[in-house]
């Protein structure tokens, strides 16, 4: 069954911690369908950002941070291994000094702590998908 | 109640045919959600479109054509009548020369016709809205 | 083994402009994630942070010499550069550059240069 | 004036435990950094991420942060400990703050 999109879930992220997303664009990529994954420092939507991550399906993928409700330097990369009209498992692994980003089980993407992930407190996905499953895993202490 | 987004619906334009939108915006515009209507030349979404006209919603407008798979010259405007958080009706009218989109009763956008309006089949509108209603009124002939 | 040199005239004057260069040995300044900074130390005081570049060129500076200050590289000589314009006698210090993975305000900076004593002074 | 505050000096005898405070910084979000530095030398990281150790960093050299507080704690003070210690954080990701520096005195 279908999550809801907008999906916002409470969490609490350190090192070892795992983000895991299922889902599938809504339109074809020609039509350019977006998917966004923000990792937030409160539980309002207007909070500040650690990671945001959003795909552009079938053009590229930006990462940045919002802090103190100013975007900052923007990274973007043109690997796309995401297939058209197929469904995506998305994983972000929370490293000692990096997110890892995992698409279909392939490491695609990686963007350098700036903020500590243990400022995280809410994860929101969103855009331009139909989500069928969220997991936050948390590193048995 | 809400309708489906994407929504998707045959239509048949031409002078004098409005097409009417009311929903929401799913995010606050710090977040950049954005609202998408496009005028398809056919049932299928990967079709040319005639008509595409994108709020980036608190940023900007761009309006488009895609013509043989081709986008081609981008229109934008800074203009911004929708409110963060607010409900929004759009209207949509095909006049002789032009498209002129109404934002809550005022005339906010104009797109001159690159394609006939006879030409649209199906109007689609999506991306991070919520959807609560969708008309098209025919000009009675 | 990353080795860094400054290079600079050791007298400026007043309301001059300020150039001080960084020649970067045993790795390019264009490899990513590293960015590459310029801090300062007035003789006898603590450290002030100027700005960095990234390995892609952008250019971040502290707020209250951003409008004096221009960082700049040279990747065919694998240098980059410090320029602080309309000097006074208070920006006299030791410059140094420096190394950091990323951000430095992630994982600090790990080499250092031995720095350059620059004196304003008519 | 600095956004981070240290405090001028610290003494410790030696072989006993030094600990170097640095106040005012967001450090629930921000990491803070420490350095060491001698006269007449550059200055040396000795630990990144809140506690991470460079490699060729003694292992008596740890950090921690809680709030708006971090701390540096050098366990076992040697005589060659005896320098200027900085505190660098964030005022943003890409702000940098130094603290106004600690003169560790080993007795």
């Known amino acids: 069954s279908l999550l809801p999109v907008p999906y916002t879930e409470a969490a609490s992220l350190s090192t070892g911690s795992t983000v895991t997303i299922k889902g599938r664009p809504l339109a074809c990529f020609l039509n350019e369908p977006y998917l966004q994954v923000d990792f937030h420092t409160e539980m309002k939507e207007e909070s500040d950002i650690v990671f945001h991550f959003q795909v552009c399906f079938g053009r590229r993928v930006v990462m940045n941070s919002r802090e103190y409700g100013a975007w900052k330097q923007q990274v973007e990369s043109k690997n796309m291994p995401f297939q058209d009209g197929q469904e995506f498992e998305l994983s972000i692994s929370v490293l000692p000094d990096k997110y890892q980003v995992m698409v279909n089980g392939q490491s695609s993407y990686t963007f350098d702590h700036r903020i500590k992930p243990e400022a995280v407190k809410m994860v929101q996905v969103w855009r331009d998908i139909s989500l069928t499953k969220f997991n936050v895993s948390y590193l048995k202490r | 109640s809400l309708l489906p987004v994407p929504y998707t619906e045959a239509a048949s334009l031409s002078t004098g045919s409005t097409v009417t939108i009311k929903g929401r915006p799913l995010a606050c515009f710090l977040n950049e959600p954005y609202l998408q209507v496009d005028f398809h030349t056919e049932m299928k979404e990967e079709s040319d479109i005639v008509f595409h006209f994108q709020v980036c919603f608190g940023r900007r407008v761009v309006m488009n054509s895609r013509e043989y798979g081709a986008w081609k010259q981008q229109v934008e405007s800074k203009n911004m009548p929708f409110q963060d958080g607010q409900e929004f009706e759009l209207s949509i009218s095909v006049l002789p020369d032009k498209y002129q989109v109404m934002v809550n009763g005022q005339s906010s956008y104009t797109f001159d016709h690159r394609i006939k309006p006879e030409a649209v089949k199906m109007v689609q509108v999506w991306r991070d809205i919520s959807l609560t209603k969708f008309n098209v009124s025919y000009l009675k002939r | 083994q990353v080795q860094r040199q400054e290079s600079g005239p050791g007298l400026v004057k007043p309301s001059q402009t300020l150039s001080v260069t960084c020649t970067v040995s045993?790795?390019?300044?264009?490899?990513?994630?590293?960015?590459w900074s310029w801090i300062r130390q007035p003789p006898g005081k603590g450290l002030e942070w100027i700005g960095y570049?990234?390995?892609?060129?952008?250019?971040y500076y502290s707020p209250s010499l951003k409008s004096r200050t221009s960082i700049s590289r040279d990747t065919s000589n694998n240098q980059f550069s410090l320029q602080l314009s309309s000097v006074t006698p208070e920006d006299t210090a030791v410059y140094y550059c420096?190394?950091?993975?990323?951000?430095?305000?992630?994982?600090?900076?790990?080499?250092w240069g031995k720095g350059t004593l620059v004196t304003v002074s008519s | 004036s600095s956004a981070l505050t240290q405090p001028s000096a610290v003494s410790v005898s030696l072989g006993q435990t030094a600990r170097i405070t640095c106040q005012g910084g967001?450090?629930?979000?921000?990491?803070v950094a420490w350095y060491t530095q001698k006269p007449g030398q550059a200055p040396v990281l000795v630990i990144y991420?809140?506690?991470e150790r460079p490699s060729g960093i003694p292992e008596r050299f740890s950090g921690s942060s809680s709030g708006d507080t971090a701390t540096l704690t050098i366990s076992g003070a040697q005589a060659e400990d005896e320098a200027e210690y900085y505190c660098?954080?964030?005022?943003?990701?890409?702000?940098?703050?130094f603290g106004g520096g600690t003169h560790l005195t080993v007795l």
């Open positions: 660098q954080s964030g005022i943003s990701s890409d702000n940098i703050v």
């Open positions: 420096a190394r950091s993975r990323s951000s430095p305000t992630t994982f600090g900076m790990d080499y």
């Open positions: 967001d450090f629930g979000r921000y990491y």
């Open positions: 045993g790795g390019s300044i264009t490899t990513g994630p590293y960015s």
């Open positions: 991420q809140d506690s």
């Open positions: 570049i990234g390995y892609s060129g952008s250019t």
